[in-house]
């Protein structure tokens, strides 16, 4: 009988991240008897939903059910049937839906209503679909990475669970880049958070945290590109836009109506004497960087210091995990190594952007052209945002760790969201039981 496997006493949870460009489903698993321990929840599956973000279904809401089917069926397969009814399902929508709601609360509500009805058809314990705030997105991302890094554990460990862990209890800041927004969240050093909107107070595992967070709507990589195009086309002399953020030889026709289809470009809107224009890449990092900087208003700051657009930002403190598109873009560009300095990153970006489009297409034949064409812009944007937007320097660059996964779980807001909604992060430190942290070993 000793060799007979005991039935696993585990629990599961599902979170759908309804982002601006796509939806991803995450399945989490944890030992039932260790719910309040830190670091025991881990991701067992990620399923990327085929198609765009849910906000794009506003004119075709009847297609949402089919859109979600494959990943929900995958969840049905991964999670044992006996667990289905007690597995909570949460859907959080982010900046794409925030933008749609700015346009019409009803339109956003209709989309969520159909999403809810679709998800209610599955055998899981559906807990609702909602648009999370930018503040929540930042906060839950911060909770996720620090939970996975073991920063909330009061146990001092002699070993390190991740390569960049410094084995102290100083939390990591969180840098999240999406398609439509970007978040910066960290614990400032003895600094008053001058704007109440950017201040969060947490008590986690018996310790108090005063956290700064801000979400910049319209400053995700996709919306930033639309902003830049809308800004630059204003001064174009004809329907050709010579763009330094695209590779030499790259050409793409853009509909003016698509350019103005987002609240993010409203400030640049004007009547143009053409319905379409052609982007012609010239591949110049420095000029691209300069163009991007024009999206950041740094001339106005009502506080002791600001990021941009008059938003308070305390002095940066400690190490930062940069995830989501920060990671995906830098990983593609092979710039995630801890050993690569900011100067080296800039040099490599200059070389990459200057490469002819035909050469790039040949070198990366397996990558979709739509994504491939935007890496020069996205990489340059990341540098501009981190250096000029958030005031990282060549010296503090080494404190940025580009993170995809920690302990097999994706860095992002979804895990933190589930931990919070399932009450798995206690305010007080739970009474320790022998071997309660054996899961780390």
């Amino acid at each position: 009988t000793q060799n007979k496997a005991l039935p696993e006493n585990v629990k599961y949870g599902i979170v759908l991240d309804a982002g601006s460009s796509h939806t991803s489903l995450y399945i989490y698993k944890w030992p039932a008897e260790k719910e309040n321990d830190t670091g025991v929840v881990h991701q067992v599956e990620e399923c990327r939903v085929k198609g765009p973000g849910i906000s794009k279904f506003v004119q075709k809401v009847n297609e949402i059910g089919i859109y979600l089917t494959d990943c929900m069926e995958r969840a049905r397969e991964v999670i044992p049937r006996s667990q289905h009814q007690e597995t909570p399902v949460y859907l959080g929508a982010t900046a794409g839906m925030r933008l749609l709601r700015m346009e019409s609360e009803e339109l956003a509500d209709r989309v969520l209503d159909v999403v809810e009805r679709s998800l209610s058809n599955y055998p899981f314990d559906f807990q609702g679909a909602r648009i999370i705030t930018g503040q929540e997105e930042g906060a839950y991302g911060w909770i996720t990475i620090n939970y996975l890094l073991g920063k909330f554990s009061q146990k001092t460990r002699w070993f390190s669970i991740v390569p960049y862990e410094t084995n102290n209890q100083e939390t990591f800041g969180a840098l999240d880049l999406g398609g439509a927004s970007t978040q910066v969240t960290f614990v400032p050093q003895n600094q008053t958070i001058e704007s109440p909107d950017n201040a969060l107070q947490f008590r986690l595992y018996g310790k108090d945290y005063n956290v700064y967070t801000h979400s910049f709507l319209c400053y995700g990589k996709d919306q930033a590109l639309w902003q830049k195009l809308a800004k630059d086309i204003q001064v174009a002399s004809n329907e050709i836009l010579r763009d330094p953020c695209f590779h030499p030889g790259y050409k793409k026709v853009v509909n003016v109506s698509d350019l103005y289809k987002t609240p993010c470009t409203k400030r640049f809107e004007m009547t143009l004497p053409f319905q379409q224009f052609e982007i012609q890449g010239i591949g110049n990092y420095q000029q691209c960087h300069q163009s991007i900087l024009e999206l950041f208003n740094t001339s106005y700051c009502p506080y002791s210091q600001c990021a941009f657009n008059g938003i308070f930002l305390p002095p940066l403190q400690g190490d930062f995990g940069a995830f989501s598109a920060f990671y995906f873009v830098m990983k593609f560009l092979n710039l995630t190594s801890e050993k690569v300095s900011q100067e080296k990153v800039t040099e490599m970006m200059k070389k990459f952007c200057a490469q002819p489009w035909e050469e790039i297409k040949t070198s990366y034949a397996g990558v979709k052209e739509k994504y491939l064409s935007e890496y020069c812009f996205s990489g340059t944007y990341i540098l501009s945002l981190l250096l000029q937007g958030y005031h990282f320097t060549a010296d503090s660059w080494e404190h940025i760790h580009f993170i995809g996964k920690i302990q097999g779980s994706d860095a992002g807001w979804t895990l933190g969201y589930m931990l919070n909604l399932t009450n798995m992060i206690p305010a007080e430190q739970p009474l320790s039981t022998p071997l309660s942290h054996s899961t780390y070993v």
């Epitope: 700015m102 346009e103 019409s104």
Partner: antibody, heavy 123, light 106 residues
Framework: EVQLVESGGGLVQPGRSLRLSCAAS????????MNWVRQAPGKGLEWVSS????????SYADTVKGRFTISRDNAKNSLYLQMNSLRAEDTALYYC????????????????WGQGTMVTVSS | EIVMTQSPATLSVSPGERATLSCRAS??????MHWYQQKPGQAPRLLIY???NLASGIPARFSGSGSGTEFTLTISSLQSEDFAVYYC????????FGQGTKLELK
């Protein structure tokens, strides 16, 4: 002061076309969804078409779908309704109306209305 | 489409009295119900938005309530200028109006 002024109405034969215009002033036009609502003589209100602030959502009543086209020119602060294949039942006073807002979010209700322009379809 | 049914079609009330107008939606519209007043020869005027919110410049004697399918517009103490036609409108789906309630002097 918010003002909406419709023009372009008149008498037209069945099957013909007409283009209505709405000139807006007193607010930032491109921040608001715009609509056409009509009212047949002695009858109630009927929504015709909507154009959301960023053109994400453009919609038409079933009675006009395929015949009418809504458009806007944000630089000219103007809303338009191109009406083709007109029928006797399209005879109505056509109002231009602005979408309201719920705090920072757009709303599909109508907080300001013009005085209307009369369209009569008759042979 | 969502059909809006207003009742009564005509309501006769004396000045100073309370008037209660009803609107029923053929399916749930959450709180996305709005009320308008229209006087002869004039454009409609927004009174209440999202079931219970008073529009700018509208006197406090007007109030709205309800959610789902049943909604009410109440005028607490009728003034002479309140005699008009009242329309409800839902915005949960593409907008539809009720047929109107005519509020007339008793």
């Amino acid at each position: 002061e918010v003002q909406l002024v419709e023009s372009g109405g008149g008498l037209v034969q069945p099957g013909r076309s007409l283009r209505l215009s709405c000139a807006a002033s007193g607010f930032t036009f491109n921040n608001y969804g715009m609509n056409w609502v009509r009212q047949a003589p002695g009858k109630g209100l009927e929504w015709v078409s909507s154009f959301s602030s960023s053109s994400t959502y453009i919609s038409y009543a079933d009675t006009v779908k395929g015949r009418f086209t809504i458009s806007r020119d944000n630089a000219k602060n103007s809303l338009y309704l191109q009406m083709n294949s007109l029928r006797a039942e399209d005879t109505a006073l056509y109002y231009c109306a602005r979408h309201g807002r719920y705090g920072g979010y757009g709303g599909f209700y109508f907080d300001y209305w013009g005085q209307g322009t009369m369209v009569t379809v008759s042979s | 489409e969502i059909v809006m049914t207003q009742s009564p079609a005509t309501l006769s009330v004396s000045p100073g009295e309370r008037a209660t107008l009803s609107c029923r939606a053929s399916e749930g519209v959450k709180s996305y119900m709005h009320w308008y007043q229209q006087k002869p020869g004039q454009a409609p005027r927004l009174l209440i938005y999202k079931a219970s919110n008073l529009a700018s410049g509208i006197p406090a004697r007007f109030s709205g309530s309800g959610s789902g399918t049943e909604f009410t517009l109440t005028i607490s103490s009728l003034q002479s200028e309140d005699f008009a036609v009242y329309y409800c409108q839902q915005s949960w789906n593409d907008p539809t109006f009720g047929q109107g309630t005519k509020l007339e002097l008793k």
